[in-house]
């Protein structure tokens, strides 16, 4: 079928970076400036993505591939292919519709993005708080109160910090 198709459809011979020009007897013409075709046999070239304003160019557009954008400093990418830019905040803050706001008491954020999350409740694991939490850091859980009683022979090491979470995207 593929061989028959290529015999019948001259456009199938047009490589990436060209388009099959119906106005010129289906000759393969190069994509015009600021456009590309990433596959062969295309009848049109796609317009290159423009990285401007909050976006900056990570990879220039070529005749065979689209431009790739990332976000200008102070913002980070969201979505497939960096379809959106979102404002960075400081550690100890989260982004709201009112801008960056400090984490409420009892919550923390150790990243420039994402939401404030509750401190670990050490007592749920039968442990005690070894190091208090802050807006930027989770609490560090230590040995259980029973392990700290007089005559206890050993001290258990602190539990590892939780894996940082990410904001919903």
């Amino acid at each position: 079928f593929e061989r028959t198709r290529s015999l019948q459809d001259p456009c199938s011979n047009c490589p990436a970076g060209t388009f099959c020009d119906n106005n010129r007897n289906q000759i393969c013409s190069p994509c015009p400036p600021n456009s590309f075709s990433s596959a062969g046999g295309q009848r049109t070239c796609d317009i290159c993505r423009q990285c401007k304003g909050v976006f900056r160019t990570r990879k220039e557009c070529s005749s065979t591939s689209n431009a790739e954008c990332d976000c200008t400093p102070g913002f980070h990418c969201l979505g497939a292919g960096c379809s959106m830019c979102e404002q960075d905040c400081k550690q100890g803050q989260e982004l709201t519709k009112k801008g960056c706001k400090d984490c409420c008491f009892g919550t923390f954020n150790d990243q420039k993005r994402g939401i404030c999350r509750p401190w670990t409740n050490c007592s749920l694991d039968g442990k005690s708080v070894l190091v208090n939490g802050t807006k930027e850091r989770d609490v560090v859980c230590g040995p259980s109160p029973a392990d700290l009683s007089p005559g206890a022979s050993s001290v258990t090491p602190p539990a590892p910090a939780r894996e940082p979470g990410h904001s919903p995207q």
């Epitope: 830019c85 979102e86 519709k97 919903p168």
Partner: nanobody, 123 residues
Framework: EVQLVESGGGLVQPGGSLRLSCAAS?????KYWMIWVRQAPEKGLEW???????????YYVDSVEGRFTISRDNVNNSLYLQMNSLRAEDTAVYYC????????????????SGQGTTVTVSS
């Protein structure tokens, strides 16, 4: 094609005023939050203000609160930033940007912005 075109920038003395405009086309303007951001020389981009779809919610970065006013005209697909009591530190390229269609619980990103208009505050 989605387009945002800013205008209204210029040179103004400290204490002066400017009104920036942003003409939107290629999308249903009234369905989106809109945002002003700025980039001062040699600095990163900074969020300035945003406004919800019908103009009933407006938020500002602390440094411009009480001096700048964001507004929109959904009939004419336009976004505005009235800038009063301008200071040298307001010198920047100002961009208007399209936010999300729902800020309830997802993100506060922007997916389209214009080329920017330059505001210079100097005596």
């Amino acid at each position: 094609e989605v387009q945002l075109v800013e205008s209204g920038g210029g040179l103004v003395q400290p204490g002066g005023s400017l009104r920036l405009s942003c003409a939107a086309s290629g999308f249903t303007f009234s369905k989106y939050w809109m945002i002003w951001v700025r980039q001062a020389p040699e600095k990163g981009l900074e969020w300035v203000a945003n406004i919800n779809q019908d103009g009933s919610e407006k938020y500002y970065v602390d440094s411009v609160e009480g001096r700048f006013t964001i507004s929109r005209d959904n009939v004419n697909n336009s976004l505005y930033l009235q800038m009063n009591s301008l200071r040298a530190e307001d010198t920047a390229v100002y961009y208007c940007a399209r936010g999300g269609d729902d800020y309830s619980n997802s993100h506060y990103g922007m997916d389209v912005s214009g080329q920017g208009t330059t505001v210079t505050v100097s005596s």
